[in-house]
């Protein structure tokens, strides 16, 4: 079922079907015998009770006040009253733009990132049974889509998709043809979600080791989901059976990015492992960043100037 009209301030365009649905509808069914009344007041005017006799354009059904269609002089405050329950709305009916297929003040703006999923579905659940056909327009030019009941666009967004999309539902009521227009202003922006990946810690790291022992070199980065982190060493990775790349660990950050950690394990350290570069690289669509590790024999550490360790 269509949800109730909870917004207290509503703007609608003249000439379109419109309805107000109060929010104690389920309650109203329970107490069928209770008196339920709709009122309107505009300006200095007192509350005037509404009924189908007050205007041929107004219809009352259970929880709903319908306008066929709504007109400029329908602007005002509307009240629904039942026992000790009251709901109030302020309705502002604005002029239709005669020179366009939509009225600028009645546009919903949406921002879609390029290459991200972009969808427009023309649906109107309340009037669904009365709708004969629906058309979708882009910048007031009709789009030729297969489904003329619920036209839909589903695609990966591109910059050319930017524009005003208007869903126009055509429906009959009491022998008259009406239309309801819902317009979206779609702005396509660049992918804003990507960060430039950051390798954590110093760019050059000297690690003190002892021959015959093992060492674990930890490379950590803050990165995007599709970014890669890997180790490069020697002429061809994997030529040294004592060197192992451990499984990457990833933890999602509260911002939806990833904290990744990849360990290079070097077992039974030999002379050939000393004073060579073990590079950890993070790569993204924005470029690469590299961090280097050099294994140095513990005894030789004294020869290395202190500033090297914080570079």
């Amino acid at each position: 079922a269509e949800s109730c009209t909870s917004r207290p301030h509503i703007t609608v365009v003249e000439g379109e079907p419109f309805y107000l649905k109060h929010c104690s509808c389920s309650l109203a069914h329970e107490i069928e015998t209770t008196t339920k009344s709709w009122y309107k007041s505009s300006g200095s005017q007192e509350h005037v009770e509404l009924n189908p006799r007050s205007s041929s354009r107004i219809a009352l059904h259970d929880c709903v006040l319908e306008f066929w269609p709504v007109e400029l002089n329908d602007t005002g405050s509307y009240f629904f009253q039942m026992k000790n329950y009251t709901q109030k709305w302020k309705l502002n009916v604005i002029r239709r733009n005669k020179h366009s297929c939509f009225t600028e003040r009645q546009v919903t703006s949406k921002i879609v990132e390029v290459k991200k999923f972009f969808q427009i579905t023309c649906e109107n659940s309340y009037y669904q049974t009365l709708v004969n056909s629906t058309s979708l327009y882009k910048n007031c030019k009709k789009l030729l889509l297969e489904n003329n009941k619920n036209p839909t666009i589903k695609k990966n967004a591109e910059f050319e998709d930017q524009g005003y999309y208007s869903c126009v539902h055509f429906l009959h009521h009491n022998g008259k043809l009406f239309n309801i227009t819902k317009t979206f202003n779609i702005t396509i922006v660049e992918d804003r979600s990507n960060i430039v990946p950051v390798l954590l810690g110093p760019k050059l790291n000297h690690v003190a080791v002892e021959l015959g022992k093992n060492v674990r070199l930890n490379c950590s980065a803050l990165l995007n989901e599709e970014d890669v982190i890997y180790w490069m060493f020697g002429e061809e990775n994997g030529s040294d059976p004592n060197i192992h790349e451990e499984k990457e660990m990833r933890i999602m950050t509260p911002e939806g990015k990833w904290h990744a950690s990849k360990v290079l394990r070097i077992e039974n350290i030999g002379e050939s492992n000393l004073n060579v570069l073990y590079n950890c690289t993070v790569a993204s669509t924005g470029g690469t960043d590299t961090k280097s590790f050099i294994l140095v024999r513990k005894a030789d550490m004294a020869d290395i100037p202190g500033h090297v360790f914080t570079r």
Partner: antibody
């Protein structure tokens, strides 16, 4: 719209250098790396290297190491590729391309190396 | 370096028929951390720069007709054109962007039979 505009064709003598420019527009320049890809006449595509427009980090193909330099100027959203010590087999169309899968390409710059 | 090998080198297919191009990488381009394949397909027509068709092995680039599709994982990939059109005559390249140097296949020339 998003595009990469490259500098014009060049004719160079062996041993000389060439510098090709690639001006980006329609997107945030520093969000994407710029790769350079070349194509010798009638041949396939060869990746030369790339530069991060964000921090200037570079990564070059091994065979061009020492002869190629890639730079960027973020104030003008322009990437540059300089190739030195030109040889006849460097004759090719040089393309700049965006990102790591190349969704936007320049039109290409023909560099002819001939004595 | 990761070596990309395409097959066949050239291919002749009748209009409206299916065209299939294969690409094999010397090592896996599937990244286990996010289950993505770092592989793209390009189309190049004479005198033009290449045009991106497919990335992440199977995601079609915006504006590319849906007769183009990519499949495969790890080391074996396929580009399929479901119903060949005259404008599809071109050279097609696969490319890995898993590790630098980013490498291309040698290309497959597609012609009409």
């Amino acid at each position: 719209q998003v595009q990469l505009v490259q500098s014009g064709a060049e004719v160079k003598k062996p041993g000389a250098s060439v510098k090709v420019s690639c001006k980006a527009s329609g997107y945030t320049f520093t969000n994407f790396g710029i790769s350079w890809v070349r194509q010798a006449p009638g041949q396939g595509l060869e990746w030369m290297g790339w530069i991060s427009a964000y921090n200037g980090n570079t990564n070059y193909a091994q065979k061009l190491q020492g002869r190629v330099t890639m730079t960027t100027d973020t104030s003008t959203s322009t990437a540059y590729m300089e190739l030195r010590s030109l040889r006849s087999d460097d004759t090719a169309v040089y393309y700049c391309a965006r990102g790591w899968f190349f969704d936007i390409w320049g039109r290409g710059t023909l560099v002819t190396v001939s004595s | 370096d990761i070596v990309m090998t395409q097959s066949p080198d050239s291919l002749a297919v009748s209009l409206g028929e299916r065209a299939t191009i294969n690409c094999k990488s010397s090592q896996s381009v599937l990244y286990s951390s996010n289950n993505k394949n770092y592989l793209a397909w390009y189309q190049q027509k004479p005198g033009q720069p290449p045009k991106l068709l497919i990335y992440w092995a199977s995601t079609r680039e915006s504006g590319v007709p849906d007769r183009f599709s990519g499949s495969g994982s790890g080391t074996d990939f396929t580009l399929t054109i479901s119903s060949l059109q005259a404008e599809d005559v071109a050279v097609y390249y696969c490319q890995q962007y898993y590790r630098t140097p980013y490498t291309f296949g040698q290309g497959t020339k597609l012609e009409i039979k």
